[in-house]
Structure formats: C-alpha cells, structure tokens
C-alpha cells in the first residue's frame, strides 16, 4: 500500500507513517513504528503541555515572582499553566500578568477619566479637540487650551491633544 | 538603583499633625509624577495624593481634602506630606511611588498611628 501523506486528527506522520499525538498533559518518549504505539510519559511536577503533541519535553509552569507582586491565582496541571495574578490593589501590566504595577499612566494626548482605585486600573480618555495633555500621568485630566482671545493675543501655532496653542501678539497694521 | 525611603511616621494624637518625607534615589527626581499611598491595618491600599513632575498640579483623595498638603524639593530629590488634623482612620503604612508604579520600586514605608 501507498505510505500516507496525510493522517487523521490526533495523529502526526513520522517515517512514511502515521503515529498517535501524545496527548495533553504528557510528552513523547519515542515515536510509533510498524509495531508498536507511541509511547508518551506523564509531564513532572512543575510541567505541563496544554495540547496534543509530539514534544520531547514539557514547559515549565510559570512562576508567579512575589519580588514582582505576584502571586498564584491558579495553579497549574499536567494539562495547564499556572495562572499568576497581583497582590491586592495592584494591576497587571499585560493579559499574562507578568509583572504589576500600581496603576497605570496615560500618556501624552490622554487624559485619566478615573483615578485607579484597588479594583480598577486608571482609565484614560483620549484629549478631545480643544483640550491636551503633554505628560504622563496617572492622575492628570486633558487641560483646556489657552485662549489667546482672553489675553488679547492671536494664535501662532495651533494645538494638539498633546500640545496647548502658542499664543503671540497682534499684528499692528501701521497707518 | 532605584530607592525610595518613607520616614516621619509615629504616634499621634487625633487633632494632630506629622510630616512625611521620601527620600528617592538613583534616578533624577525632578520631572517624575510622585504619589503617596497608605495601607490600614487589614485594608486595601489607598492611593491618598498626588504631585506632577513640574508641581503645578496635585490630587488628594476626599478624605484626606483640605488636611493633607502634598510638596516636592527637587533640589534635595525628596517628596512631603504634610498631615494635619489627623483622624483616627489616618491610620496606615503610607508609601510613596514613582512612575511608572512597579512593583520594585516599592518602598518600606513608615507607620503612622492616629490614637489617643
């Protein structure tokens, strides 16, 4: 018979044939042949693979760093990572948690629409037109932008959301 | 190496007042946004002021309005609060934080206990 050149679901193709995935939660030990099944072992203590595979070794489970704020949310299996979170009234800096911060800051061209509380990091707006921020804060709101109007000047350089307007003085028109 | 150092904490009566400072270290202080933060006995935490890298702009929580005053030397790279009309539930481990806010830049904190 014509060797495969494809196999089923669950299965990967090694030496003209088509061998069974070691399944989540262990890693293969040696490869099927024409006698015998893939063998696959048990992940260790500490490893884990999350899928069907055909790896040699299993990953490390994360370490949730206390030195970094973190701490274990959920521990890991043979079948999954272990899920790291921050110490109470701190924040994720990414969807994997892998370090914390206070709260976060806006940066220039938003403004904060709430402070950080324990629950919830800050939540930054983007600087309408008229209003800007030129920092980095975790506190400050878009300031409004100066009105040259009031102070008797014209604008010589319009504003941004990260830029206030640059006022100067009117052109006198001589007699 | 970034440090920062709390100290001013102690015992005072309510009605009194205390001055905070943090000393920081090992990057240049001026232009840096600077927060004071303070831990109850079995609470969370609660972020109390604020002072932006220039100092024109500052934010205090409401139950610290009108008591509290925040204040930065750049010249001696230290951060203050000064507290006055202190309450018992002022009560805490107060810190100060730096951006961007890590958790290693923590500092140790002092204690200040409001009690009669």
């Known amino acids: 018979p014509e060797p495969p050149t494809a196999c089923r679901e669950k299965q990967y193709l090694i030496n003209s044939q088509c061998c069974s995935l070691c399944q989540p939660g262990q890693k293969l030990v040696s490869d099927c042949t024409e006698f015998t099944e893939t063998e696959c072992l048990p992940c260790g203590e500490s490893e884990f693979l999350d899928t069907w595979n055909r790896e040699t070794h299993c990953h490390q489970h994360k370490y949730c760093d206390p030195n970094l704020g973190l701490r274990v949310q959920q521990k890991g299996t043979s079948e999954t990572d272990t899920i790291c979170t921050c110490e109470e009234g701190w924040h994720c800096t990414s969807e994997a948690c892998e370090s914390c911060v206070l709260h976060r800051s806006c940066s220039p061209g938003f403004g904060v629409k709430q402070i950080a509380t324990g629950v919830s990091d800050t939540i930054c707006e983007p600087c309408p037109v008229g209003f800007f921020s030129n920092v980095s804060s975790a506190f400050e709101k878009c300031h409004p932008w100066t009105s040259c109007e009031t102070k008797d000047l014209v604008v010589q350089q319009a504003g941004t959301n990260k830029t206030d307007v640059v006022c100067g003085p009117q052109d006198r028109l001589r007699a | 190496e970034v440090q920062l150092l709390e100290s001013g904490g102690g015992l005072v009566q309510p009605g009194g007042s205390l001055r905070l400072s943090c000393a920081a270290s090992?990057?240049?202080?001026?232009?840096?946004e600077m927060w004071w933060v303070r831990q109850a006995p079995g609470k969370g935490l609660e972020r109390v002021s604020a002072i932006s890298g220039s100092g024109g702009s500052t934010y205090y929580a409401d139950s610290v309005k009108g008591r509290f005053t925040i204040s930065r030397d750049d010249s001696k790279n230290t951060l203050y609060l000064q507290m006055n009309s202190l309450r018992a539930e002022d009560t805490a481990v107060y810190y100060c934080?730096?951006?961007?806010?890590?958790?290693?830049?923590w500092g140790q904190g002092t204690l200040v206990t409001v009690s009669s």
């Open positions: 934080a730096k951006e961007p806010y890590s958790f290693d830049y």
């Open positions: 090992g990057f240049t202080f001026a232009g840096y």
